[in-house]
């Protein structure tokens, strides 16, 4: 598999990390998060060329199927492979809590 | 999040599990694979409109966040939840060896 | 850049209360929550508690509930802590600390030393 | 509430040495860790979150590691300037709690 930062469409153009600056209201969280009022929220986007960061046996057959049956068969999918936790501050019947979601941001990013 | 048949786009249209049959030629493996002669490929297919089988909360904001900035943000992509093993019959220097591959077909498909 | 200032020291008699104020600066006041921790002379630290400052909504440890008052003046940009019916064992500094995430503190004010002393 | 336990109490390094600060939750916190450095006469600084997150400005010569109840914070070559004492945080469940620090002194 290609090197992560090797992107044969150009760089910065592959599946990578970007950062989206979102708010509660953006989020449709507005009405039950306190904290924090904005959140970075880090996904993955970009395109999965041939093998580029190519997760497991099935993003490589996908690839191969895809380059074979391109109506049929998507290219791969930029995911994350990982996440990174995040506390959010949230409205409560008595008050508010704390609670960590441990599935809300992309730590790093895979083709699937 | 919409039940996992409930397509909102019209049966079938929705991310779900397709089965492609794929030879070793198709894969490019037939110089290191010698069984099975063809294999069928289950993969995840479909598109994944708001809330669908969405994986986890990273998949809610990428649909609140892709409503808002289409351009930036890609819609949640339909991949692999879990993946059922296979074993393959493969050519080594001294003969053949039987590999199981824990990666290679999806079992079920979730939006992310 | 983000900062926080806090006022200055405070010398008390057992009973009384104290007010210690936090001014921010360098981003959006309401888009950080601010939390309240001490440090005893000699030990460690001790988180009091939290405030929201877009609408005041705070959580206390419950240790100082009842004693301890979280509020913000939003238009001042300045969030403060008042502690009653002082004891000698609340001299400490209080430090205002500003967070991003709720879960850890990323920036903190100065130090306010309270002394409680008859 | 969660106590957090930190050791040693004191530790005394030679600067290039490595340096391992542990601290022990009372039940699991997952990862919800946090590791501050805090000089005399200063406010603390926040050094690694989430038990083995990097933050901007930090040396790369601190480190954080662990989960659930033991957890790790490692100076692989200590320098004059981190001498100070070290304080575990977690954020697993209000109230916060801190640990009674570790003190790192330069030989």
């Known amino acids: 598999a290609r090197n992560g930062d090797d992107c044969p469409l150009g760089p910065g153009r592959c599946c990578r990390l970007h950062t989206v600056r979102a708010s509660l209201e953006d989020l449709g969280w507005a009405d039950w998060v306190l904290s924090p009022r904005e959140v970075q929220v880090t996904m993955c986007i970009g395109a999965c060329p041939s093998q580029f960061r190519a997760a497991n046996m099935h993003a490589q057959i996908k690839t191969s199927l895809h380059r074979l049956k391109p109506d049929t068969v998507p290219a791969p999918c930029c995911v994350p492979a990982s996440y990174n936790p995040m506390v959010l501050i949230q409205k409560t019947d008595t008050g508010v809590s704390l609670q960590t979601y441990d599935d809300l941001l992309a730590k790093d990013c895979h083709c699937i | 999040a919409r039940n996992g048949d409930d397509c909102p786009l019209g049966p079938g249209r929705c991310c779900r599990l397709h089965t492609v049959r794929a030879s070793l030629e198709d894969l490019g493996w037939a110089d290191w694979v010698l069984s099975p002669r063809e294999v069928q490929v289950t993969m995840c297919i479909g598109a994944c409109p708001s809330q669908f089988r969405a994986a986890n909360m990273h998949a809610q904001i990428k649909t609140s966040l892709h409503r808002l900035k289409p351009d930036t943000v890609p819609a949640p992509c339909c991949v692999p939840a879990s993946y059922n093993p296979m074993v393959l019959i493969q050519k080594t220097d001294t003969g053949v060896s039987l590999q199981t591959y824990d990666d290679l077909l999806a079992k079920d498909c979730h939006c992310i | 850049q983000v900062q926080l200032v806090q006022s200055g020291s405070e010398l008390k008699k057992p009973g009384a209360s104290v007010k210690v104020s936090c001014k921010a600066s360098?981003?959006?006041?309401?888009?950080?929550?601010i939390n309240w921790v001490r440090q005893a002379p000699g030990q460690g630290l001790e988180w009091i508690g939290w405030?929201?400052?877009?609408?005041?909504?705070?959580k206390y440890n419950e240790k100082f509930k009842g004693r301890a008052t979280l509020t913000v003046d939003t238009s001042a940009s300045t969030a403060y802590m008042e502690l009653s019916s002082l004891r000698s064992e609340d001299t400490a500094v209080y430090y205002c600390?500003?967070?991003?995430?709720?879960?850890?503190?990323?920036?903190w004010g100065q130090g306010t030393t309270v002394t409680v002393s008859s | 509430e969660i106590v957090l336990t930190q050791s040693p109490a004191t530790l005394s390094v030679s600067p290039g040495e490595r340096a391992t600060l542990s601290c022990r939750a009372s039940?699991?916190?997952?990862?919800?860790l946090h590791w501050y450095q805090q000089k005399p006469g200063q406010a603390p600084r926040l050094l690694i979150k989430?038990?083995?997150q990097s933050i901007s400005g930090v040396p790369d010569r601190f480190s954080g590691s662990g989960s659930g109840t033991d957890f790790t914070l490692k100076i692989s070559r200590v320098e004059a300037e981190d001498f100070g004492v070290y304080y575990c945080?977690?954020?697993?469940?209000?109230?916060?709690?801190f640990g009674g620090g570790t003190k790192v002194e330069i030989k």
């Open positions: 600390a500003g967070t991003y995430d709720p879960a850890y503190f990323d920036y």
């Open positions: 360098g981003y959006t006041f309401t888009s950080y929550d």
């Open positions: 405030i929201y400052p877009r609408d005041g909504i705070s």
């Open positions: 039940q699991s916190i997952s990862y919800y």
């Open positions: 989430y038990a083995s």
């Open positions: 945080q977690q954020s697993n469940s209000w109230p916060y709690t």
